[in-house]
Interface confidence: low
Amino acid sequence: DTHKSEVAHRFKDLGEEHFKGLVLVAFSQYLQQCPFEEHVKLVNEVTEFAKTCVADESAENCDKSLHTLFGDKLCTVATLRETYGEMADCCAKQEPERNECFLQHKDDNPNLPPLVRPEVDVMCTAFHDNEATFLKKYLYEVARRHPYFYAPELLFFAARYKAAFAECCQAADKAACLLPKLDELRDEGKASSAKQRLKCASLQKFGDRAFKAWAVARLSQKFPKAEFAEVSKLVTDLTKVHTECCHGDLLECADDRADLAKYMCENQDSISSKLKECCDKPLLEKSHCLAEVENDEMPADLPSLAADYVESKDVCKNYAEAKDVFLGMFLYEYARRHPDYSVMLLLRLAKAYEATLEKCCAAADPHECYAKVFDEFQPLVEEPQNLVKQNCELFEQLGEYKFQNALLVRYTKKVPQVSTPTLVEVSRNLGKVGAKCCKLPEAKRMPCAEDYLSVVLNRLCVLHEKTPVSEKVTKCCTESLVNRRPCFSALELDEAYVPKAFNAETFTFHADMCTLSEKEKQVKKQTALVELVKHKPKATKEQLKGVMDNFAAFVEKCCKADDKEACFAEEGPKFVAASQAALA
């Protein structure tokens, strides 16, 4: 399926609008500090060139690979050395090393100012004045802050963003219409970015075998009526799509994702009864819908797994014959029967089954050796079940904010070397599992909770990899993808940690505290809580609660005072002294 001109092929397949959007996303994810106008200029140049290739595929340079074309374009940026430092050295390399070099310089935590939302009227004016520029700006700002955002999905978000403004800028109460929609897009976008980051980490750090195993388990839960070969085909195609997107090949990725959606909709009968409503939608919405589709009902007459995977005398023969296919079938059979298990648990069970076969198939009596393999699964199943039960009980008892605080204390004690902003971000997100999952019925709690925690902990791993400070974090992040969460859960208080010296500056607050939003106030308090634990890692829950209650009272008192700044200046040192005494 080779084409004389790859760029012409993709331009024709995707159409001009999607082509331009995806090139803008690709460039913004690589050069995260470049100004918007610079990127727009580069995209326009690439688009004009693509059009010449569509007109004549034999034209000069049209036969070059997309990496070559895009890399050459990125390397024309005049300020590359000043803005990006050593990333400019990538331009001295040849493809494919140059693209690999750009990928390695993607920054998961770029030093960019937080996006400030202007007044609604200002946004609506900008939208009406130049809709195209307004939407490009959205793609650019999201892509540069989220360099692994799933590009075809970002086009879907942009379409929803556009629809929100088109509807709400005509409404009587623009703000009431628009702001909830923008909040929803922001929250969904952050979640989508984090989920995709885990997929890319899985592929890049653990290889496509790890990703394929994840995909077999997840798709088998979603499509339990599909044959194993059907699931395998979907897994192969999905792996290609995500490998491309994670590798910066966004045009190929979007094109292949569209092909996959087309295939699924043409073959609904052999995949799932739940695809119908997705397949009537336009492309971007259809692909999103298929990705989020609910699990189909399990076939009624599924036989016991024991016959083929435990009782059969041929287990070792079958395993030896084609290990990955046999294990893939085991994972498929187990996952389709267990929509109530997290994907990570299913992968742990498959790993345990594989380990048992590796050991037993070399034993004198293999069948006797692996006969009790399913009994060995019990503790693996009970561990996340108990964890979810305990944490949901704690969440229901404390509410989200205090539950986050409990996790902040727990994780700061485990890995106190990690930076305070990272601990706050990660623990706040870990704490959101309560509201997200604990309200669900029992059968949906574990898949919701543990697979969400895997996404959040991946963020910790990604940030920590950039600036490694803790051997424990490195160990949990790199040893096993499926055991990351149990590894972090098992960490205890770090006895080797030397407590941080007390710094009064960290606990000095000002009147600007009073004008912060509720969320920003929480972050300030939680930042102080982490610093307290770093200073006194052995402080009890009661001691910490006392200090935090005093802190809340002190802030409330000063924010009600006539001279707020004077109050903070006077009461602040008293609060610090009282806290030190309470924790002594």
Epitope: A229, K233, D308, F326
Partner: nanobody
């Protein structure tokens, strides 16, 4: 769409021969081991024979060893079962499966051995 379509069954006298074929489509046939399974009236499925993805390694149930031969043509995406010296107890619906699964994913082809 994954499809497995068996053919070649029929009525044959004891001691006779048949060659079953299974045409596969909708998946990467050459990447998977394949099996033949049979189900006699009123009985559960019984694994008959298996072949690895490349066709080099073949396995047989004791009941058919020496009489049946499994083979495949990856270019034609077809699996075969050559059945010689057929016995009345070989009467069953024969169907092909992916890997070593005994769960039916196809209609099968009826083989009847009777005088």
């Amino acid at each position: 769409q994954v499809q497995l379509v068996e053919s070649g069954g029929g009525l044959v006298q004891p001691g006779g021969s048949l060659r079953l074929s299974c045409a596969a489509s909708g998946f990467t046939f050459g990447s998977f081991g394949m099996s033949w399974v049979r189900q006699a009236p009123g009985k559960g499925p019984e694994w008959v024979s298996a072949i690895d993805s490349g066709g080099a390694d073949t396995r047989y149930a004791e009941t058919v060893k020496g009489r049946f031969t499994i083979s495949r043509d990856n270019l034609k995406k077809t699996l075969y079962l050559q059945m010689n010296s057929l016995k009345p107890e070989d009467t069953a619906v024969y169907y092909c499966t992916i890997g070593r699964s005994t769960s039916r994913g196809s209609q099968g082809t009826q083989v009847t051995v009777s005088s």
